[in-house]
Interface confidence: low
């Protein structure tokens, strides 16, 4: 083997955001002369699991038949090609939805408003949560999330949108979670359609920019960030 072993690639199928009970496969791809693949889970001693390569020996399959809390977390893989070990892959964040009951998303004062009216999206959870995420269908990323300060557990979060224009119209959902585990999310709320009638003024910036946190004990941190497994949550709603 000339030079260092290439870093392997790790990915999940059908994706890295998996609903509770659904199957998921973690793949690790290295080189054709790999003898053994190891998968590490952050917070667990290494290796979390070990697999022999599948022919033609350049990748290994780690199967999770049914997604539970047990499997949510950050994974890296590496492989052995005698006499060396590869470096670790980039991390894979495996996120589970369905850890908590789905919240209820509503639009105040109404899901049918006139351009220029102020609108607030209200996300209510059945049990106390401290992190709420709002999604708009078709948006590349989640909108800013609300996280309560000092770990306060709340049953709701407000997403004030201010005066709306047609740009704000669309389908929204929200998800709740608890900050002690970024990898465990609630089921997504049922979708809510916001319809904005009559646009007499020039369009305002996109909702991603215009949403600001509610006043009070809430603290807004923008999404996504590179280290946050909740970034890039776009599909796999159910």
């Amino acid at each position: 083997q000339a030079g260092p072993l290439p870093k392997p690639t790790v990915w999940a199928e059908p994706g890295s955001v998996i609903s509770w009970g659904s199957p998921v496969t973690i793949w690790c791809q290295g080189t054709l002369d790999a003898q053994e693949y190891h998968l590490d889970k952050e917070g667990s001693p290494a290796p979390w699991d070990t697999q022999n390569p599948l022919e033609p020996r350049n990748k290994a399959k780690f199967s999770i038949p049914s997604m539970t809390q047990h499997y949510a977390g950050r994974y890296r893989c590496y492989y052995h090609s005698h006499p060396d070990w590869s470096e670790d892959s980039d991390p894979l964040d495996l996120v589970m939805t369905g850890a908590y009951s789905k919240p209820i998303l509503s639009v105040l004062p109404s899901p049918l408003v006139t351009s220029g009216e102020s609108v607030t999206l209200l996300c209510q959870s059945q049990s106390p949560m401290d992190t709420f995420l709002l999604f708009k269908e078709g948006a590349a990323h989640p909108l800013p999330r609300l996280r309560s300060q000092h770990g306060a557990q709340l049953h709701w979060a407000e997403f004030p949108m201010g005066p709306v224009t047609s740009v704000h119209g669309g389908t929204y959902r929200c998800i709740s979670s608890r900050s002690f585990s970024h990898y465990l999310l609630s089921r997504p709320s049922d979708p809510v359609e916001l319809t904005v009638l009559g646009s007499l003024e020039s369009p305002s910036p996109s909702p991603t920019r215009s949403i600001s946190a509610a006043a009070g004990p809430e603290d807004q941190s923008l999404m996504p960030t590179g280290s946050d497994p909740q970034s890039g949550l776009r599909r796999h709603w159910e």
Epitope: W20, G21, S44, P45, T68
Partner: antibody, heavy 123, light 108 residues
């Protein structure tokens, strides 16, 4: 305070079925897995399976696949285990145990246990 | 399935004595998924140590746990009368989740 209150002792005939209940209080019932464990007299513990009350998803020890059926009633925060086709081998104490997730160690464990339900199978 | 073998099956210790019991797995178990439970006669088991070394709520600091791979242990630095009980190790690294046969700790 978290409490799991199980139903009382059962004396049943061979071939019959029995349904044991486990009523949870003091926490959000849908947040934690509910595990069921068997302990035969003077013996060790045997894991039967679990149910996730949030969506009714279950996982069983294959040994108990056709022996036990796990269900929940979210409205009353109660978990149930039905045991089928009972024989003397099924005489034991059965425990329910709720399992919170300990995120910072990436693990969950049976943290809260019911008082146990004694099932005696005898003709 | 992963078989957990506890040794000794029965042991007795004097008050103040240091006690160690072991749990050996038939194949490697991640330390995150190895727990210990305490059970006294006529009572339900109680979570005692979770994820190899974390003491459950209310467990005295004289208890500790350690280990990795296939070998784990529970230690009491100084035996007290209330520690007399049966201790079970438990894994859920692989399904089915399994328990060891237990170590019964008695007072000498």
């Amino acid at each position: 305070e978290v409490q799991l209150q199980q139903s009382g002792p059962e004396l049943v005939k061979p071939g019959a079925s029995v349904k044991i209940s486990c009523k949870a209080s003091g926490y959000t019932f849908t947040d934690y897995n509910m595990d069921w464990v068997k302990q035969s007299h003077g013996k060790s513990l045997e894991w039967i399976g679990y149910i996730y009350p949030n969506n009714g998803g279950t996982g069983y020890n294959q040994k108990f696949n056709s022996k036990a059926t796990l269900t929940v009633d979210k409205s009353s925060s109660t978990a149930y285990m039905e045991l089928h086709s009972l024989t003397s081998e099924d005489s034991a104490v059965y425990y329910c145990a709720s399992s919170p997730y300990y995120d910072y160690v990436g693990s969950y464990a049976m943290d809260y246990w019911g008082q146990g339900t004694s099932v005696t199978v005898s003709s | 399935q992963i078989v957990l073998t506890q040794s000794p099956a029965i042991m007795s210790a004097s008050l103040g004595e240091r006690v160690t019991m072991t749990c050996t797995a038939s194949s490697s178990v991640s330390s995150s998924y190895l727990h210990w439970y305490q059970q006294k006669p006529g009572s339900s088991p109680k979570l005692w140590i979770y994820s190899t070394s974390n003491l459950a709520s209310g467990v005295p600091a004289r208890f500790s746990g350690s280990g990795s791979g296939t070998s784990y242990s529970l230690t009491i630095s100084s035996m007290e009368a209330e520690d007399a009980a049966t201790y079970y190790c438990h894994q859920y690294h692989r399904s089915p989740r399994t328990f060891g046969g237990g170590t019964k700790l008695e007072i000498k």
